[in-house]
Interface confidence: medium
């Protein structure tokens, strides 16, 4: 592989590494969305919530005379509970509301697939760099692109989950905004998917320059 190509691959791998860090951050944190209630009459506090793939946290925030609750960064009593994805016998009612269990299960499962693809891609990259097997960059690039797509699907599933929670008359939450974990997931998708495609392009053998050349005549990769 030429020096120019190697530099391009390294820059791409750096972008992919950033995507991996962002994907991991998004998966393990629970600030995908922040939900605020609207109440016609309320006590001195209100209950805002933020949630991720694995758990939901409600926070009791002091409320002023207005109808708004928050921001969630205000100090308050926090209470978190994990979604019971893998305990079908247990009740899915958390904090007096029924979670959109099927949505969070789907998003979490797809996120696990994404992490699986990231691990496979990283193994291919490590083997490629260690033993100069440049051809392993091609499956690695595909794995990263698939990981990115999985993150995108997780993002969309979570969007639907938030929409359904807000539209539901069975929660007190009526307003929402997407938070930093969601932004991390979106950025991870862009970096992993585009990085995967770029890595695939850079790791392909040079195309023949002349009509009489075949792929076999192209320069060796190492």
């Amino acid at each position: 592989m030429s020096q120019t190509k190697m530099l391009k691959v390294r820059v791409t791998l750096f972008c992919i590494l950033a995507g991996i860090v962002l994907a991991m951050t998004a998966v393990v944190t629970d600030h995908w969305a922040v939900l605020s209630p609207h109440m016609e009459h309320h006590n001195t506090t209100c209950e805002a919530a933020h949630f991720g793939l694995w758990r939901i946290c409600t926070k009791r925030i002091p409320m002023d005379d207005s109808k708004t609750c928050g921001p969630i960064t205000l100090p308050g009593e926090k209470n978190c509970s994990y979604f019971r994805h893998f305990n079908p016998g247990e009740s899915s009612e958390i904090f007096e509301f029924t979670t959109q269990k099927e949505y969070s299960i789907s998003a979490a499962a797809i996120a696990i697939f994404s992490l699986g693809f990231i691990i496979l891609g990283s193994l291919c990259v490590l083997l490629s760099l260690g033993k100069k097997r440049d051809y392993l960059l091609r499956p690695a690039s595909m794995f990263y692109a698939f990981a990115g797509l999985c993150i995108l699907v997780s993002v969309e599933v979570m969007r639907q989950s938030v929409k359904r929670m807000i539209d539901s008359e069975d929660t007190v939450w009526i307003e929402y905004y997407y938070s930093w974990s969601f932004a991390c997931a979106c950025a991870a998708f862009i970096l992993l998917f585009l990085g995967g495609l770029a890595l695939l392009l850079f790791s392909l053998p040079r195309m023949p320059r002349n009509p009489w050349e075949s792929c076999m005549d192209a320069e060796p990769e190492h």
Epitope: P37, H38, M39, E40, H41, H42, N43, T45, C46, E47, R60, M63, K67, F95, E96, F97, E169, D170, T171, V172, I174
Partner: antibody
Framework: EVQLLESGGGLVQPGGSLRLSCAAS????????MSWVRQGPGKGLEWVSS????????FYADSVKGRFTISRDNSKNTLYLQMNSLRAEDTAVYYC??????????????????WGQGTTVTVSS | QSVLTQPPSASGTPGQRVTISCSGS????????IYWYQRLPGTTPKLLIY???QRPSGVPDRFSGSKSGTSASLAISGLRSEDEADYYC???????????FGTGTKVTVL
Amino acid sequence: EVQLLESGGGLVQPGGSLRLSCAASGFTFNNYGMSWVRQGPGKGLEWVSSISGSGGTTFYADSVKGRFTISRDNSKNTLYLQMNSLRAEDTAVYYCGKGGYCSSSGCRHYGMDVWGQGTTVTVSS
Amino acid sequence: QSVLTQPPSASGTPGQRVTISCSGSSSNIGNNYIYWYQRLPGTTPKLLIYRNNQRPSGVPDRFSGSKSGTSASLAISGLRSEDEADYYCAAWDDTLSGYVFGTGTKVTVL
């Protein structure tokens, strides 16, 4: 199917008392605010009283404050309206209504998305 | 006396668009959601619009709600004979700490 069924209406003399009941089914009763609304003969709808899901917060219209008491028994899925010192102007069809979802902080709203069929209260001597 | 003011009557021919207004103050409509109820003759009231402009399932899209400042309106497009009923607006009132209904509007299909 969400259903509300009122009972306890009837003819009562001025100054008398009456207790209305509203049996709820088809939803998790203690998670929702509940209200009583009435409609007098030839009149429009008038809100009477509301109660939060836990029963800890109650609201009354000025016209019934001090005379009417709203309560609920979540174990029986039943809403009550105790009416004392009844007056002729309390003559109306009384409806119970299911309000919005409640959390420990308050209720989403007390707007009635489901109504009962109504029970008639006549105050006359 | 009702805190929310509605016109006593409104009418239109089949297919026409009819609008019912509801006027209040900052303590009710201005700061809270508006609800619209339909009362067909001889029946119990039915929720028509909630949260200013949301329709419950089963309510035709001919009915639409809107809110601006301290007033709200309900529009019925493509008026039908079965729309002949009493219509009430309602909102929570922060000052009264209670629910307030409008005076009611009788819609007649000519």
